[in-house]
Amino acid sequence: EPPTACREKQYLINSQCCSLCQPGQKLVSDCTEFTETECLPCSESEFLDTWNRETRCHQHKYCDPNLGLRVQQKGTSETDTICTCEEGLHCMSESCESCVPHRSCLPGFGVKQIATGVSDTICEPCPVGFFSNVSSAFEKCRPWTSCETKDLVVQQAGTNKTDVVCGPQDRQR
């Protein structure tokens, strides 16, 4: 009797199990009682990355420089092109269809993780004992100056945005 299910890398059509096309090839014709599945390679600008019965290959992704994109890895008949962002930019989404500038960490925040082509800057609040007085995509929170090691005393306490202000010790005692 005709099959109702097929093996791996096969598909059921017209009560027959036909071989799927291998990655990098598209389906031209289903198999028959007398012939194998007919497949053709994808053209240079196209790909298919799985065993398939697609009648059209997918177009390689275009890395549009107007959107801040560049080619990280050229596509093949079996893989899509991988885009990444130009220096100073990162992908807006996982699919990386466009890029946006890395965000800077505002005063009071420091860089926890520097941005990459695919991830934005990660900022963290400066904890007690640390500060950041600049808006930067690179600078971490810096520790307050240690007045004691300079034989000075704290004249003005530090905040998450400002360093402590050191001054000479009062010698009029």
């Epitope: 071989s19 031209v28 014709s29 289903d30 198999c31 028959t32 009682e33 007398f34 012939t35 194998e36 599945t37 007919e38």
Partner: antibody
Framework: QVQLQESGPGLVKPSDTLSLTCAVS?????????WNWIRQPPGKGLEWIGY???????NYNPSLKNRVTMSVDTSKNQFSLKLSSVTAVDTAVYYC?????WGQGTLVTVSS | DVVMTQSPLSLPVTLGQPASISCRSS???????????LNWFQQRPGQSPRRLIY???NRFSGVPDRFSGSGSGTDFTLKISRVEAEDVGVYYC?????????FGQGTKLEIK
């Protein structure tokens, strides 16, 4: 329902070219089937002559050497056979077939 | 070429009794995808060949279930579980795994 119908002269002179056409109805010829020619000399078994596909790709029986030419006309949904330099041994019923469907056959006699 | 050898060439059978036809190929008919393109055809007197079995054991639609095919590699069998009067004719195996396609020489089934 798929139907195949052979047509062509029933009598061919020795050394001439035998020409037959097969009209296909009920199914488009532009599919992944082999469109075959098979012959059967009187009182004998079946002999495969060759096949052609919708894209013109073909395979012929080497025993018929370089005498066979097949063509396909997708606009008319038909395919054809030419067999050159015929002799009496080419006298046979000629079938066109998709293998699951066959024409009724046409007897071609080679005689002067 | 792949040589297809059928046996017996003549098969007298009593109505209602089983019948078995063997077909052997000179090389394996299994292709790289694991498919074996071995077919069986019936040719009743004065008619075109009719499809029975494809890919060793698959019955074409409309073929009675008293017909069954089996085998693998180079050894194949067509069985008729209970022969009926309408089964009289010549039975051919055909391989379409290798080009040129080749038929067996035919087995003539007749009623005793």
């Amino acid at each position: 329902q798929v139907q195949l119908q052979e047509s062509g002269p029933g009598l061919v002179k020795p050394s001439d070219t035998l020409s037959l056409t097969c009209a296909v109805s009920g199914y488009s010829i532009t599919t992944n089937y082999y469109w075959n020619w098979i012959r059967q000399p009187p009182g004998k078994g079946l002999e495969w002559i060759g096949y052609i596909k919708y894209d013109g790709s073909n395979n012929y029986n080497p025993s018929l050497k370089n005498r066979v030419t097949m063509s396909v006309d997708t606009s008319k949904n038909q395919f054809s056979l030419k067999l050159s330099s015929v002799t009496a041994v080419d006298t046979a019923v000629y079938y066109c077939a998709r293998l699951d469907y066959w024409g009724q056959g046409t007897l071609v006699t080679v005689s002067s | 070429d792949v040589v297809m050898t059928q046996s017996p060439l003549s098969l007298p059978v009593t109505l209602g009794q089983p019948a078995s036809i063997s077909c052997r190929s000179s090389q394996s008919l299994e292709n790289s995808n694991g498919n074996t393109f071995l077919n069986w055809f019936q040719q009743r007197p004065g008619q075109s060949p009719r499809r029975l079995i494809y890919k060793v054991s698959n019955r074409f639609s409309g073929v009675p279930d008293r017909f069954s095919g089996s085998g693998s590699g180079t050894d194949f069998t067509l069985k008729i579980s209970r022969v009926e009067a309408e089964d009289v004719g010549v039975y051919y195996c055909l391989q379409v795994t290798h080009v040129p396609f080749t038929f067996g020489q035919g087995t003539k089934l007749e009623i005793k």
